[in-house]
Interface confidence: medium
């Protein structure tokens, strides 16, 4: 995978690993988590181009059949290749627990 | 996940399944491959509506900060969720081999 | 050169079928890439976009106009054909072909041929 | 469907002046490789259309460096530098990212 500064659109325009912060509320979490009570969620976001990052094999057949049909066929797509775990506080019935989600979190990001 | 009947906005335009055909020379992999001479790609095609075939905890957040955010947020993207292996004849210098591909054809979708 | 001459009728009648003939060189249609769509415009108006037809025999058609095209092509004879059923006057119009190369834009055009529809 | 909205239907300008036109889709037309195919045309009385530019900002071949596009997202915006009388016709932007549709159209004419 190459890296986000080798991207040909421009310093940080393709696929890469941006931080955005949530309250609870702008998650919908308020009615069933007590902490953090916001999050910087890490996400991908950006570009796609020419092998950029590809994943895989698909990832490559992808562009090629996007280059030819590009009304029909989308382009490769930026999305996690991995997770950070995160540590939730939950409201029970009982009164609280923690719970670690496994997939709430990217930590790095290709292109598929 | 829901299947492709229920999509909120109209039967077979959320992520599925499509199959297109292309051919070695579509591909760019003539000068390397000798069969198949078509090759029939499964691709994740579709769009990716609030929790639609959500893959994880990840996808439902980017729904939520993508309709605060939609400039900022992009919605979740129709990917494969798992794949197909493919075995192609590749052309070597001593002659031909066979070479399986666990990567290149979808075998369904999710969106993340 | 790449060159796109469109032949067609001229005159019909309403609920008469419309048959379009694309004729073009320069460029196969068995080229991965290559497409021709038809376009048209009625006297003093903008330009619809009507069908599109790949080098694979993959084809699209305008959703408000589909039940009534059918897109065709013979890639040995490097002719494109449209096919619209049960026309009517708002059909009158001046049709275009154009070339749809990589990433889908028209480089080469016809000079088009003119339909009246009348009543 | 993708609307494509110009603006404005008629472009009164005079010999020499710069001259913008804008095009406006009813939804994003940016595909995830960043590219976004969308076209300029030039239709002069008579003839047939011309590509200009095409994926929003690259020149075809041939094509006066007077003419220039740019835009993101839903907007996108033909600029001419100069006017010169062989300019003069109607101006259709179109985008094929989705089922493929014109804007409808522009005309530069002599104020």
């Known amino acids: 995978a190459r890296n986000g500064d080798d991207c040909p659109l421009g310093p940080g325009r393709c696929c890469r690993l941006h931080t955005v912060r949530a309250s609870l509320e702008d998650l919908g979490w308020a009615d069933w988590v007590l902490s953090p009570r916001e999050v910087q969620v890490t996400m991908c976001i950006g570009a796609c181009p020419s092998q950029f990052r590809a994943a895989n094999m698909h990832a490559q057949i992808k562009t090629s059949l996007h280059r030819l049909k590009p009304d029909t066929v989308p382009a490769p797509c930026c999305v996690p290749a991995s997770y950070n775990p995160m540590v939730l506080i939950q409201k029970t019935d009982t009164g609280v627990s923690l719970q670690t989600y496994d997939d709430l979190l990217a930590k790095d990001c290709h292109c598929i | 996940a829901r299947n492709g009947d229920d999509c909120p906005l109209g039967p077979g335009r959320c992520c599925r399944l499509h199959t297109v055909r292309a051919s070695l020379e579509d591909l760019g992999w003539a000068d390397w491959v000798l069969s198949p001479r078509e090759v029939q790609v499964t691709m994740c095609i579709g769009a990716c509506p609030s929790q639609f075939r959500a893959a994880n905890m990840h996808a439902q957040i980017k729904t939520s900060l993508h309709r605060l955010k939609p400039d900022t947020v992009p919605a979740p993207c129709c990917v494969p969720a798992s794949y197909n292996p493919m075995v192609l004849i590749q052309k070597t210098d001593t002659g031909v081999s066979l070479q399986t591909y666990d990567d290149l054809l979808a075998k369904d979708c999710h969106c993340i | 050169q790449v060159t796109l001459k469109e032949s067609g009728p001229g005159i019909l009648q309403s609920s008469q079928t419309l048959s379009l003939t694309c004729s073009f060189s320069g460029f196969s249609l068995s080229t991965s890439g290559m497409g021709v769509s038809w376009i048209r415009q009625p006297s003093g108006k903008g330009l619809e976009w009507l069908a599109h037809i790949y080098w694979d025999d993959d084809k699209r058609y305008n959703p408000s106009l589909e039940s009534r095209l059918t897109i065709s092509k013979d890639t040995s004879r490097n002719q494109v054909f449209l096919k619209i059923t049960s026309v009517d006057t708002t059909d009158t119009a001046t049709y275009y072909c154009?070339?749809?190369?990589?990433?889908?834009?028209?480089?080469?055009w016809g000079q088009g041929t003119t339909l009246t529809v009348s009543s | 469907d993708v609307v494509m909205t110009q603006t404005p239907l008629s472009l009164p300008v005079s010999l020499g002046d710069q001259a913008s036109i804008s095009c406006r889709s009813s939804?994003?037309?940016?595909?995830?490789?960043?590219?976004?195919?969308l076209e300029w045309y030039l239709q002069k009385p008579g003839q047939s259309p011309k590509l200009l530019i095409y994926k929003v900002s690259n020149r075809l071949s041939g094509v006066p460096d007077r003419f220039s596009g740019s835009g993101s997202g839903t907007d996108s915006t033909l600029k001419i530098s100069r006017v010169e009388a062989e300019d003069l016709g109607v101006y259709y932007c179109?985008?094929?990212?989705?089922?493929?549709?014109f804007g409808g159209g522009t005309k530069l004419e002599i104020k």
């Open positions: 939804q994003s037309i940016v595909h995830s490789n960043g590219n976004t195919n």
């Open positions: 154009a070339r749809g190369g990589y990433d889908g834009y028209y480089d080469y």
């Open positions: 179109f985008q094929g990212s989705h089922v493929r549709t």
